[in-house]
């Protein structure tokens, strides 16, 4: 058997000592004679030890013994003991008792023979077995005074060899993760949950992570089991960005020719039906009315102009009804209505004139007289020596119920090259030039234009009266929207419950799938905030698309250009949502077109205003924006600018 070098030397040293034993004993007797019984000099002591190191060690201490006990001649027993002990460096034993196997006396020196695991001159230093090759341990080596042992990291156990480690499979214990999935790992294990859930070690269960607390959303955040959704202020013109967390501007994706003509006057600006222009003419000289202008409209009904005095005196109103010119007049309290001429709401320019002659009024379209009415009196009325005439354009200075025959005064029409009383009119021209809202689009087509900044609403009833009920259904919502969008996000149609501030129903354009968190151009049909159905749409192609929505007891369908949309809810969820809608329909609801009122962004999938052309048919009735309970003044009721032609 081979021993390490250090152990071998320690094993050999005692044997060497035994070889010198005889010599040591002889030396002791010689010392007795020369230096204990007699007083010896350094030279004599040298002869005893026969070497310098032991002599140099002995002699100074010998002199100390003399100083302490007196010379040999005093025969003090303490002196003899003192001197006899000097050559043995192991007495008293300088080595550490715990770590020493034996002390070996050397010439003026000593050697401590150490036990295994100890080292150092005095065998008082523990040997760190772990410092070399980790003491042979695979994982953890623990050093101990005079010894060491191996151990393993948490999740491992020590093999029978006392040195290697093997993995513990914690997942073998079915209680390790409780409800969660257990995955064994080297030296450990992990309790796994689905995305959006986090493991609770206390409850040993998966708990929903509230991502909203992490501030992931730029604006509004709604947490849901295992997920979350961000919402942006649609009414503020914002939508979700690609990352589905931040917000970005809703920008037009189809350019519309929205250029306006500074030499035109838009008549449909005031939804209230009040005039867009009020002129006051006053003359010392009796004067007759002469008005001429170019006019263009698609609107079938509305007021072009009023001329005269106050409502009970003498006045005329030139209006449009069913696309034809109508003249209402009141002379000295007697009212009349005349309608004649061609249909003129074809969207093309034509010249219209009203001329007051001596005893009649003549109305011309493109210089051809279409009406000639005999009148008794003058429109300019004398008052305190001056003749007065009020002329208003696009409305009347009193309520429409006070007309000879009530009419909807709102007229989405355009006027240019106007001439009142044969005079140059710098006032209106100057006003229009600086106010773009008073100007018309240079080019228009049929339809209604929603500029992305407002809505219109109606008070419609969706509950069928008992007379209508031939089927089991007691309510229905059927919407057909012809749209030519200019932007990819916006509310087309919605119902709003003012009492509950809820959005019972909405149909909107959206550019992402909220649950799949995927950017995609869609039409969404929703009850409150829940999407019932989705359908893809090529929203930015500049083409007209038809969106059809049909909801009644037990069914809800969404179609885009004749293709049916994908249902987003189960049959049970659909029934529950339709029941919610029906509850809302039994209370007062308002029908919104092109947007929503100021509701929380979480009320519906989309809250942004629609931008583009749209006509709406609700329950087989075309909605006329002039008939709305309210319409934003920037929405044009019967005209829409065309898509800008692509640059060559």
């Amino acid at each position: 058997a081979l021993l390490p070098a250090r152990e071998a030397t320690q094993f050999l040293r005692p044997r060497q000592r035994r070889a010198f034993q005889v010599f040591e004993e002889a030396k002791q007797g010689h010392l007795e004679r020369e230096c204990v019984e007699e007083l010896c000099s350094r030279e004599e002591a040298r002869e005893v030890f026969e070497n310098d190191p032991e002599t140099d060690y002995f002699y100074p201490r010998y002199l100390d013994c003399i100083n302490k006990y007196g010379s040999p001649y005093t025969k003090n027993s303490g002196f003899a003991t003192c001197v006899q002990n000097l050559p043995d460096q192991c007495t008293p034993n300088p080595c550490d008792r715990k770590g020493t196997q034996a002390c070996q006396d050397l010439m003026g020196n000593f050697f401590c023979l150490c036990k295994a695991g100890w080292g150092g001159r005095l065998c008082d230093k523990d040997v760190n077995e772990c410092s070399q090759e980790n003491g042979g341990c695979l994982q953890i080596c623990h050093n101990k005074p005079g010894s060491f042992h191996c151990s393993c990291h948490s999740g491992f156990e020590l093999s029978s060899d006392g040195r290697t480690c093997q993995d513990i499979d914690e997942c073998a214990d079915s209680e390790a993760c409780g409800e969660a999935r257990c995955k064994n790992l080297p030296g450990s294990y992990s309790c796994l949950c689905d995305e959006g859930f986090a493991y609770s070690s206390q409850e040993k269960a998966c708990r929903d992570v509230d991502e909203c607390l992490q501030g992931r959303c730029e604006q509004v955040c709604v947490n849901s089991p295992g997920s979350y959704t961000c919402h942006c202020d649609g009414r503020g013109g914002l939508k979700l960005s690609q990352d589905m967390d931040t917000c970005e501007d809703i920008l037009p994706c189809v350019p519309f020719s929205v250029a306006k003509s500074v030499k035109s006057l838009y008549l449909g600006r005031m939804f209230s039906g009040t005039p867009v222009i009020r002129l006051r003419f006053k003359r010392l000289q009796p004067t007759r009315l002469v008005a001429e202008f170019d006019f263009r409209t698609f609107d079938p009904e509305g007021i072009l102009l009023f001329a005269g005095g106050h409502q009970d005196s003498t006045w005329i109103v030139l209006a449009l009804r069913a696309g034809r010119l109508e003249l209402q007049l009141r002379y000295n309290g007697v009212g009349r209505v005349t309608s004649s001429g061609p249909v003129i709401n074809h969207g093309m320019w034509q010249t219209i004139s009203v001329e007051e002659l001596a005893r009649n009024l003549v109305i011309k379209v493109n210089r051809d007289a279409v009406m000639k009415i005999a009148v008794a009196g003058d429109l300019f009325q004398p008052e305190r020596g001056l003749y007065h005439l009020n002329l208003t354009v696009g409305g009347i200075p009193f309520h429409e119920k006070d007309l000879v025959q009530p009419i909807n005064p709102r007229l989405d029409g355009c006027m240019r090259s106007w001439n009142w009383l044969n005079g140059e009119d710098t006032t209106i021209q100057e006003t229009v030039k600086v106010n773009t809202r008073m100007q018309c689009f240079s080019v228009t087509e049929r339809g209604s234009f929603y500029p992305g900044s407002g809505f219109a609403f109606y008070s419609l009833d969706y509950m069928r009266t008992p007379l209508d009920v031939g089927t089991e259904s007691t309510w229905e919502v059927e919407v057909v929207a012809h749209i030519r969008p200019a932007a990819d996000t916006g509310v087309l149609f919605a119902l709003w419950a003012p009492d509950l501030r809820a959005v019972p129903l909405s149909v909107a354009l959206v550019d992402y799938h909220s649950t799949k968190k995927l950017k995609k151009q869609l039409v969404v049909l929703a009850v409150e905030h829940t999407a019932l159905a989705l359908m893809e749409i090529k929203v930015c192609d500049g083409q007209e698309h038809v969106v059809t929505v049909s909801l009644r007891d037990g069914e809800a369908t969404l179609e885009v250009d004749g293709t049916r949309g994908q249902s987003e809810v189960s049959a049970a969820q659909l029934q529950e949502r339709l029941a919610v809608l029906e509850r809302h329909l039994r209370s007062p609801v308002l029908t919104f077109a092109g947007g929503l009122p100021d509701v929380p962004v979480t009320s519906a999938p989309v809250t942004a205003f629609y931008r583009g052309c749209m006509t709406l048919e609700v329950n087989r009735r075309l909605l006329d924006l002039d008939e709305a309970a309210y319409k934003h003044s920037d929405i044009t009721a019967h005209s829409c600018p065309p898509v800008e032609p692509a640059a060559a």
Epitope: R280, F281, K282, L284, Q285, R384, G385, L386
Partner: antibody, heavy 116, light 107 residues
């Protein structure tokens, strides 16, 4: 463009007569009446009256009845103011102004000086 | 006849000052008040017509207010070219009558 151009300054002796003209252009002359306004040196404006350009009928304020006459020549779209038996206090700038209930368009004014 | 009392008859002001001229009528004239500016040797220029309407081409620093019998012409920030004489004119009834005028001079 509406323009009213008046005749030049006049220096007259007391008792004499003067006739100043106001030539209108840029509009239908007979559609608007013509007004006359006086401004004595360092004084304010005084409305003298007006003439109906359709009928030629003049209307004078109380202060200007008698020696003052408004007349027309529609063929040359001109209105006239004649002052007879001139007095020193008739020294003033006389303006014509188109009738619009108020006065938007004015002639440049004609200074009539009455001095012996 | 409706008489117009204009005040002050003259005022001194500096460029940038806010200037107010008033005109009081002897009868209620609704809002049939007009304001004119006249510079020496020139014809009057209409600034504000009936209904406190600012005329085309007139700077927005000029404004008219009032109805009934009390009327005001305000120049919000006097400019060098505004030093002139200002007149009010009522067009409610015949005879038409002017105020005596207010001369705005440089301080």
């Amino acid at each position: 463009q509406v323009h009213l151009v008046q005749s030049g300054s006049e220096l007259k002796k007391p008792g004499a007569s003067v006739k100043i003209s106001c030539k209108a252009s840029g509009y239908t002359f007979t559609n608007y009446g013509m007004n006359w306004v006086r401004q004595a040196p360092g004084q304010g404006l005084e409305w003298m009256g007006w003439i109906n350009t359709n009928t030629g009928e003049p209307t004078y304020t109380e202060e200007f009845k008698g020696r003052f006459v408004f007349s027309l020549d529609t063929s040359v779209t001109t209105s006239y103011l004649q002052i007879s038996t001139l007095k020193a206090e008739d020294t003033a700038v006389y303006f014509c102004a188109r009738d619009e209930g108020w006065f938007v368009y004015w002639g440049q004014g004609t200074l009539v000086t009455v001095s012996s | 006849e409706t008489t117009l009392t204009q005040s002050p008859s003259s005022l001194s002001a500096s460029v940038g000052d806010r200037v107010t001229i008033t005109c009081i009528t002897s009868t209620d004239i609704d809002d049939d008040m007009n304001w004119y500016q006249q510079k020496p040797g020139k014809a009057p220029k209409l600034l504000i017509s009936e209904g406190n309407t600012l005329r085309p081409g007139v700077p927005s620093r000029f404004s008219g207010s009032g109805s009934g019998t009390d009327f005001t012409l305000t120049i919000s920030s006097l400019q060098p070219e505004d030093f002139a004489t200002y007149y009010c004119l009522q067009t409610d009834s015949v005879p038409l009558t002017f105020g005596q005028g207010t001369k705005v001079e440089i301080k």
